[in-house]
């Protein structure tokens, strides 16, 4: 995993510019895991980052996450029941100017140095669907989620509501 | 626009099942988390358990061996189930809705009315 | 389980005085806090959410401010309507308790 000291070292400042159009509501770093306790990992190689689900050794420190909450309105329009919903939607950073986004062609997720304002690519909504874990659902593809596939994170389509308890979208965010 | 309405019995004996129902209106349970929430009386809030959007559910460990929720989505209505009562279940029971869709970081932003349950023989 | 707990428990003060609540966490919990307003009677209103954000049609007096395992509400000025029980809860990991409550009463 590489040094993820500058994440550590990132200020307020960094988040403080307004991305599309709106400011996160909170940020804060966590470790990124899956159900099974597997940790996300992100590698410097070739001069790109490449993105790993691993097992740590046991005392090898887990890379952490800035994670930047937006709220998103929804309008009734889109909703269907006939009521403005919100929903928050997250950012996942590991180092400065990079982001976590979703490769919607490729079916992949993929770490890309960019510019704020973020794509939509780097927007993900996030659900609770099942006890004290988490799943990131594409912005600009509805329906599918960030997930686990063969070590790596992958985008996976969830065709219904019973599919979003599968483990492999579930993870789980720790702050030690 | 948005209704969430408790109903069952007011009176329960010790030993029996609590049986309540909560309906609702202007929102989708396909889209929101619903919880039930519980208040003895002249006491704080004690959070029961919770039906998500994707319909899993929660429960709170300390009445787990107890509870059930349940939903009837064509009824836009999800109830709760507690066995075995005794004296100490007697509280006003509330079902809430989440504040955001898909997750509860948000709190409950809506509420029902409330419904005294007593447990006495 | 994460224990939340209140202070004061209960506090008299005047119309327009600065009032401040405080809720401890038992570990971290983010900012993943809400505030609630229950008046006797009736059900709990979300006052705060996210531990900083207003509710919609909740008066700008009311604001939350913390992070972590530290937080606060403060009534920048006291209101005949703001008399009432206030309840914080952790939304970080189920179960989602609650602070035991602080009463607000009229000095």
């Known amino acids: 995993a590489f040094g993820i000291s500058g994440v550590q070292k990132y200020t307020r400042a960094l988040h403080d510019s307004s991305i599309t159009g709106i400011s996160p509501i909170t940020e804060y770093l966590a470790s990124l895991s899956t159900y099974n306790d597997q940790s996300i990992t992100f590698a410097l190689e070739d001069e790109s980052y490449e993105i790993y689900v691993e097992d740590l050794k046991k005392d090898e420190k887990k890379d952490k996450v800035l994670l930047s909450y937006y709220e998103s309105q929804h309008p009734s329009n889109e909703s269907g029941d006939g009521v403005d919903g919100k929903m928050l939607m997250v950012t996942l950073s590991p180092t400065k100017d990079f982001w976590l986004h979703a490769n919607n062609k490729e079916h992949s997720v993929e770490l890309h140095k960019c510019e704020k304002p973020l794509p939509d690519q780097a927007f993900f909504v996030l659900h609770n669907m099942h006890s004290n874990c988490v799943s990131f659902e594409c912005k600009t593809d509805p329906g599918v989620f960030i997930g686990v596939k063969d070590n790596h994170l992958a985008l996976i389509k969830v065709d219904s509501s019973e599919n979003l308890c599968t483990e492999n979208i579930l993870f789980k965010l720790s702050e030690t | 626009q948005v209704q969430l309405q408790e109903s069952g019995p007011g009176l329960v004996k010790p030993s029996e099942t609590l049986s309540l129902t909560c309906t609702v209106s202007?929102?989708?349970?396909?889209?929101?988390?619903v919880h039930w929430i519980r208040q003895p009386p002249g006491k704080g809030l004690e959070w029961i358990g919770v039906l998500r959007a994707g319909g899993t559910i929660s429960y709170n460990s300390a009445l787990m061996s107890r509870v059930t929720i349940s939903v009837d989505t064509s009824k836009n209505q999800f109830s709760l189930k507690l066995s075995s009562v005794t004296a100490a279940d007697t509280a006003v029971y509330y079902c809430?809705?989440?504040?955001?869709?898909?997750?509860?970081?948000?709190?409950?932003?809506?509420w029902g009315q409330g419904t005294l349950v007593t447990v006495s023989s | 389980d994460i224990q939340m707990t209140q202070s004061p428990s209960s506090l008299s003060a005047s119309v327009g005085d600065r009032v401040t609540i405080t809720c401890l966490a038992s570990?971290?919990?983010?900012?993943?806090l809400a505030w609630y307003q229950q008046k006797p009677g009736k059900s709990p209103k979300l006052l705060i959410y996210?531990?900083?954000r207003l509710a919609d049609g909740v008066p700008s007096r009311f604001s939350g401010s913390g992070s972590g395992t530290d937080f606060t509400l403060t009534i920048s000025s006291l209101q005949p309507e703001d008399f009432a029980t206030y309840y914080c809860?952790?939304?970080?990991?189920?179960?989602?308790?609650f602070g035991q409550g602080t009463k607000v009463e009229i000095k």
């Open positions: 996210a531990a900083t």
């Open positions: 809430a809705r989440d504040h955001y869709y898909y997750s509860s970081f948000g709190g409950f932003a809506s």
């Open positions: 570990q971290t919990i983010a900012t993943w």
């Open positions: 809860q952790q939304l970080y990991n189920t179960p989602y308790t």
């Open positions: 202007g929102f989708s349970l396909s889209k929101y988390g």
